[in-house]
Interface confidence: low
């Protein structure tokens, strides 16, 4: 740990702080009686240049003056912005083994004079806040630069604060620590920022403002809302504000919305009535404040108030549908179904549904409440029945929806014509039809009903349906439509007291089935063969099956097989063929066909008919 400046001194001309592009002369001098022992003439002074503690240059060739063995002067040029360290070392040339000894060092700072500060902006946050100003300092000076913020105002008011910028911190904002009060509302204030460093100084233009120009109110706080008589649409928003606030801006929106409702309120005094809220809806409310109607700045938005409006009784009409099934000669099962109200109609949490089944002559009335969206009852087959359903939340019930229970497919004259089902894409099917040809009574509406054709679907799954006005002849069905599944689609035409229907099968996308039907038995009756099979499992059908094909050929024959194509019916699982020769052994198999193609063959069965040939 040697004292690096015990051996000598280093000086800089013109100064250790220079403008960018200037040169400097660095002189290194040994103190008396210092240097290489016995041989003063062998003293060699060298100058090393370091940037960020890394040696970048030996300035041996930049000597401009030399007193042998006593002092040397070096000229340095092209110094980059920032700080550069120069270290003078003594090299005793007679002793090659000893490294040069440090004599002394100097730091040279290269920078620029400060530019005049610009874009001064001052704010006072809240009536009790303090004035703080910020500015744009201009180009970086690379030197320690002092900034002074001066404020002057009425009644000889003066105030100033200082800060500095260097390579570790930036000074472009100062808080004066003084509070401007509302009684100075009309007064004018002037601020100026002065910048000084070792290479020069500059001053901003004066910036003039009034109390209203710079005071930004604090955002409102403690926001709350009271709902008048627990109303779901009317509420009084309340908040705390600073005393001088004369104007508020309110914004509010349902939580899932993307656009705000905006309201301006003058002299609200922390209270505002809202009248257009949606019941049972999560809302977000925010408020901003201003101290003057025309001038001044808005506060930041307050933190949000998030709350849910109270419930109101449901509005809207339930969409009801039903199924009828005869149980025996004098009883029938009625299954009622309905769709949930959408949130804007439910206006609360639906607690239950009130269901009524009534015989029109008022002889019998069945009533019940249920939390489900379906209800099943057994009623007599005699009499004309009507059903009604209403939805109830904590505030009340919707108006009941009525529907007449008619024989849905009972009137052939009301059956829609030319029903077709075309796949539109993976998720929907376009159903079209023509109106009934000879309807006795006017069609009041069409109902398109669909359900997957899978085992137990009638009992397990409720139907899906769409109500269609009487002048429309098409429907795009998409709810619960999945690709590669066959749906039974019914189009019902309903009049006041009758119903007619037509049925079709359809799918939204199809592939050839995975396998063919499995032949379970071949029996011979009266010189005809009856082929029996089990249907393809539901997941392997991959759409609506259009036909089954029965193939046969003589065993060991290389000829093309013969085939019989059967229209697919779900209820059919056997079919006769009668063109086989007796006492010839045949191989038989089956395939299934969808609109996409034919399945691989099912199992093969051999059979040798015994009867005489046809």
């Amino acid at each position: 740990n040697i004292d690096v400046c015990k051996l000598g001194t280093v000086t800089v001309q013109p100064a250790p702080v220079i403008p960018l592009g200037s040169a400097a002369n660095i002189s290194c001098s040994l103190n008396p009686k210092q240097g290489c022992s016995h041989y003063p003439s062998s003293n060699e002074l060298i100058l090393l240049k370091f940037v960020n503690d890394v040696l970048v240059e030996n300035l041996h060739g930049k000597k401009v003056h030399d007193h042998t063995g006593h002092s040397s002067t070096f000229q340095v040029t092209n110094l980059s912005l920032g700080m550069t360290l120069f270290v003078c070392k003594l090299n005793c040339s007679n002793s090659q083994k000893k490294p040069p000894v440090p004599v002394c060092g100097v730091e040279i700072s290269v920078g620029v004079a400060p530019e005049p500060p610009q874009n001064i902006s001052c704010v006072q946050e809240g009536e009790n806040g303090t004035v703080a100003c910020s500015w744009n300092s201009g180009k970086v000076t690379y030197l320690k630069t002092n900034y002074t913020l001066q404020l002057s105002g009425p009644n000889n008011l003066t105030c100033q604060k200082q800060c500095f910028s260097d390579n570790r911190q930036n000074c472009n904002r100062l808080d004066l620590g003084i509070n401007l009060s509302p009684d100075l509302a009309e007064s004018r204030f002037i601020v100026r920022v002065t910048a000084i460093n070792d290479l020069g100084n500059s001053s901003s233009l004066p910036h003039t403002f009034t109390f209203l120009d710079i005071v930004i109110p604090l955002p409102p706080w403690d926001i709350r809302i009271n709902f008048l008589n627990a109303s779901g649409s009317r509420g009084t928003l309340q908040w705390e504000d600073e005393g001088q606030v004369v104007l508020n801006q309110l914004r509010y929106q349902p939580l899932n919305s993307t656009s705000w409702n905006m309201v301006n309120a003058t002299n609200a005094k922390g209270k505002y009535d809202l009248r257009d809220l949606r019941p049972f809806t999560e809302y977000e409310f925010q408020i901003s404040s201003k101290l003057h109607l025309s001038g001044g700045s808005w506060s930041n938005w307050s933190e949000s108030l998030r709350t849910r409006t109270p419930e109101e009784e449901p509005v809207g009409i339930l969409d009801i549908w039903y199924m009828k099934q005869d149980i025996d000669y004098d009883r029938q099962q009625i299954s009622l179904f309905w769709k949930s109200l959408n949130p804007s109609e439910a206006r609360g949490k639906i607690l239950h549904y009130q269901v009524t089944l009534q015989e029109v002559t008022k002889k019998t009335t069945l009533q019940n409440t249920t939390r489900h969206t379906s209800w099943t009852r057994v009623i007599p087959r005699t009499g004309a029945w009507t059903a009604s359903v209403s939805a109830a939340n904590s505030k009340g019930a919707s108006a009941p929806t009525h529907i007449n229970i008619v024989d849905l497919c009972g009137t052939g004259l009301l059956a829609p014509h030319q029903v077709s089902a075309k796949s539109e894409n993976m998720d929907n099917i376009l159903v079209t039809w023509q109106p009934p040809k000879k309807a006795d009574s006017a069609v009041r509406e069409y109902i398109v009903e669909w359900r997957a054709l899978q085992p137990g679907s009638i009992t397990k799954f409720p139907p899906h349906w769409l109500r269609i006005p009487p002048d429309n002849m098409s429907a795009l069905i998409s709810e619960n439509i999945k690709p590669y599944i066959c749906y039974e689609i019914r189009v019902h035409a309903l009049s006041e007291s009758q119903g007619g229907c037509s049925s079709i099968r359809g799918d939204s996308k199809h592939k050839a089935p995975v396998s063919g039907p499995h032949i379970t038995a071949i029996t011979e009756k009266k010189e005809r063969l009856f082929i029996s099979w089990t249907h393809i499992p539901f997941p392997e059908q991959r759409g609506c099956i259009l036909h089954y094909r029965i193939y046969w050929k003589e065993r060991d024959s290389t000829a093309q097989p013969e085939l019989c194509e059967i229209q697919y019916r779900r209820s059919q699982n056997s079919h006769p063929i009668s063109s086989l020769q007796p006492r010839v052994t045949y191989v038989l198999w089956m395939t299934a066909v969808t609109a996409a193609g034919e399945s691989p063959q099912g199992n093969e069965r051999e059979f040798c008919p015994q009867g005489k040939a046809n």
Partner: nanobody, 128 residues
């Protein structure tokens, strides 16, 4: 700005009780939903309980229902979590949190993202 300070944690035998406190000097604390969350080592932060601004609504994680009770003090600037029938699975650092919104009387959230201000946490250790 809302500063929160939890206290009341410590070591307790299984079956014992502790009462955690969450204090705040912020003037808006009483206007916010306040929740307790806990975090066991190596696990995610887990919702425990929450109370609405006017104490009308409370919510609890299924695992603590019937054992823990959340409440607000009379001055509204403290929220308590009374923990009874503690078991070793309750061992964790317990954090108090205040919502980043003024919450309406109906509003309670179990999502940590709905809470902006958090305390430093207090350690609760339940030994068997």
């Amino acid at each position: 700005q809302v500063q929160l300070q939890e206290s009341g944690g410590g070591l307790v035998q299984a079956g014992g009780s502790l009462r955690l406190s969450c204090a705040s000097s912020g003037r808006t604390f009483s206007s916010r939903t306040v929740g307790w969350f806990r975090q066991a080592p190596g696990k995610e932060r887990y919702f425990v309980a929450a109370i609405s601004r006017d104490t009308a609504y409370t919510d609890y994680a299924d695992s603590v229902k019937g054992r823990f009770t959340i409440s607000r003090g009379n001055a509204k600037n403290t929220v308590y979590l009374q923990m009874n029938s503690l078991n070793p699975e309750d061992t964790a650092v317990y954090y108090c949190a205040a919502s980043h919104i003024y919450s309406g009387s109906h509003y309670i959230s179990a999502r940590s993202s709905d809470y902006m201000y958090w305390g430093q946490g207090t350690q609760v250790t339940v030994s068997s």
